[in-house]
């Protein structure tokens, strides 16, 4: 059953150019694999709290503990990474707080900034003191397990010294690591004793061994790379947005809708309108009009700006977002006041989420 009647044909062509929406950056909690993580839901006066991960309900299990406003993840794994939300259900409304969990080691073995001064890792020896290879900076080699999100860059480092200066080669899963073994190859920076792989993919998972050797000896060190994959999900909208607003006749107002979606989202701003003096069609469904949608001729679709408003602009505005997987929508109300009344954004009054599901 359709939930509304469109007042006019709203052809959605031309489609929007591709955009990767990750506009709103929620707080990020980082944990290393195997660690425990505890997050407190930062919402007040919560009668009942429910949790989701990547838009899917999260229940307790042998590693996930939900106690009051706390979420505990024991022995975190890269699979625990994702977009989490806690929703506080109250008597009259509900509110959601989003946060990211990233279960991963540092993306590189040692910080990227080290490359600027990394020459210090290239130790020159007095030519008389012959010496087998040795590690010069073991702190940069402590983290052996690297869990990295797909498409990120990975850098492994094995800073070493010796005399004569040792050479470095890399193995993957115990075999010679060749450029043709991965799309885009890899970079070796001998000056910094590093291996760099850009835009990692799942097939990059495995053990990477640096072998450092000269005529007096050989040493090696192995890193394990795990590439964390994403799962596609329906769009997720930041709770409390768009927010209710008020303005005087002739004033301007802006509604904002924050979208989380890896897959290409299509954003629509819709308003309940009247046709022939009626808000509902013969089928009993409300008349709706698409005011703005993402596309080539549209500026930032996450923002709906209304200028020089009239009393007729008052009413409910819906932000509706769709990707190829599913949809989500939330709405807000615009109150238009007579000229003599001072407007104020009604921060306290947020429309409760109204998902078309």
């Amino acid at each position: 059953r359709p939930s509304f009647s469109l007042v006019e044909d709203t052809t959605l062509e031309p489609e929007e150019p591709p955009t990767k929406y990750q506009i709103s950056q929620p707080e990020v909690y980082v944990a290393a694999p195997g660690e425990s993580l505890e997050v407190r839901c930062l919402l007040k006066d919560a009668a009942v709290i429910s949790w989701t991960k990547d838009g899917v309900h999260l229940g307790p299990n042998n590693r996930t503990v939900l106690i009051g406003e706390y979420l505990q993840i024991k022995g975190a794994t890269p699979r625990d990474s994702g977009l989490y939300a806690c929703t506080a259900s109250r008597t009259v409304d509900s509110e959601t707080w989003y946060f990211m969990v990233n279960v991963t080691d540092a993306i590189s073995s040692g910080d990227d900034e080290d490359d600027t001064d990394g020459a210090e890792d290239f130790v020159s020896e007095n030519s008389n003191n012959k010496r087998a290879p040795y590690w010069t900076n073991t702190e940069k080699m402590e983290k052996r397990l690297h869990a990295v999100p797909a498409a990120n860059t990975v850098k492994f480092r094995c800073p070493a010294g010796g005399n004569p200066m040792p050479t470095m080669r890399w193995l993957k899963n115990g075999k010679e690591f060749k450029q043709e073994h991965r799309i885009g190859g890899y970079k070796v920076r001998n000056q910094h004793w590093s291996l760099i792989m850009e835009s990692v993919v799942p097939s990059d998972k495995g053990n990477y061994t640096c072998v450092v050797e000269n005529e007096y000896g050989s040493i090696n060190h192995t890193y394990h790379l795990d590439v964390v994959e994403r799962s596609p999900h329906r769009p997720i909208l930041q709770a409390g947005l768009p927010a209710n607003a008020s303005t005087v006749v002739g004033g301007d107002v802006e509604f904002v809708c924050k979208v989380y979606s890896d897959a290409q989202p299509h954003i629509q701003w819709i308003k309940h309108v009247e046709k022939n003096g009626s808000k509902y069609g013969p089928d009993g469904l409300p008349y709706l009009k698409v005011l703005k949608h993402s596309g080539i001729n549209s500026s930032n679709a996450e923002v709906l700006a209304l200028f020089n408003v009239t009393e007729a602009d008052a009413g409910e505005y819906i932000c509706k977002v769709s990707n190829y997987i599913g949809q989500a929508n939330q709405s807000a109300w615009l109150t238009v006041l007579p000229k003599q009344q001072a407007p104020g954004r009604e921060k306290e009054i947020t429309a409760s989420p109204d998902y078309l599901e």
């Epitope: 959605l12 031309p14 997987i325």
Partner: antibody, heavy 112, light 106 residues
């Protein structure tokens, strides 16, 4: 587990219509788009359109607009694809798809 | 509409060899999706969001690329990998597929 079970094969005359059904189970039917894709014999895949059962929103390929109608029955978790004014080049296997799962396909043969 | 061109149309290789399948879009897309299809079967989602393997897809498969050029790579072919592979874009309506690359045993 997720399952999409489609109706059986059909033989149709040119100019007539066909209605293919796709019964979904194992997930929340109203929360995901149901897409329809067809494949002519020995040919590639062609996206036709989709429906969002939660509010009956539809999205069609321009090529099929006016000739295809996609509907959904929430009570039975079933999606339907009706193609009218059939011609011989519409002979194909028609698939329903929930982004990560596909139905087994329905062969529609258009022949006089 | 966005036209996806796959190359080669047919790729003849032996088990154990490396396979590289290409998909080029007529205009930029944000992600590419890949499907595997065997004779008499429905297509199976294989790679989503350019580089993520679908459930049950072996680690020897990897996807990469950006903008208009995307690649599906099979590091070492197994007998069960021989099939037709289609790329698809979900960036704009109509959501088009490539014409397919048939991976056959040499």
């Amino acid at each position: 587990q997720v399952q999409l079970v489609q109706s059986g094969a059909e033989v149709k005359k040119p100019g007539s219509s066909v209605k293919v059904s796709c019964k979904a189970s194992g997930y929340t039917f109203t929360s995901y788009w149901m897409h329809w894709v067809r494949q002519a014999p020995g040919q590639g895949l062609e996206w036709m359109g989709a429906i969002y059962p939660g509010n009956s929103d539809t999205d069609y390929s321009q090529k099929f607009k006016g000739r295809v109608t996609i509907t959904a029955d929430e009570s039975t978790s079933t999606a339907y694809m009706e193609l009218s004014s059939l011609r011989s080049e519409d002979t194909a296997v028609y698939y329903c798809s929930k982004f990560d799962y596909w139905g087994q396909g329905t062969l529609v043969t258009v022949s006089s | 509409e966005i036209v996806l061109t796959q190359s080669p149309a047919t790729l003849s290789l032996s088990p154990g060899e490396r396979a590289t399948l290409s998909c080029r879009a007529s205009s930029s897309v944000n992600y590419m999706y890949w499907y595997q299809q065997k004779p008499g079967q429905a297509p199976r989602p294989w790679i989503y969001l350019t580089s993520n393997r679908a459930t049950g897809v072996p680690a020897r498969f990897s996807g990469s690329g950006s903008g208009t050029d995307y690649t599906l790579t099979i590091s070492s072919l197994e007998p069960e990998d021989f099939a037709v592979y289609y790329c698809q874009q979900w960036s704009s309506n109509p959501y088009t597929f490539g014409q397919g690359t048939k991976l056959e045993i040499k």
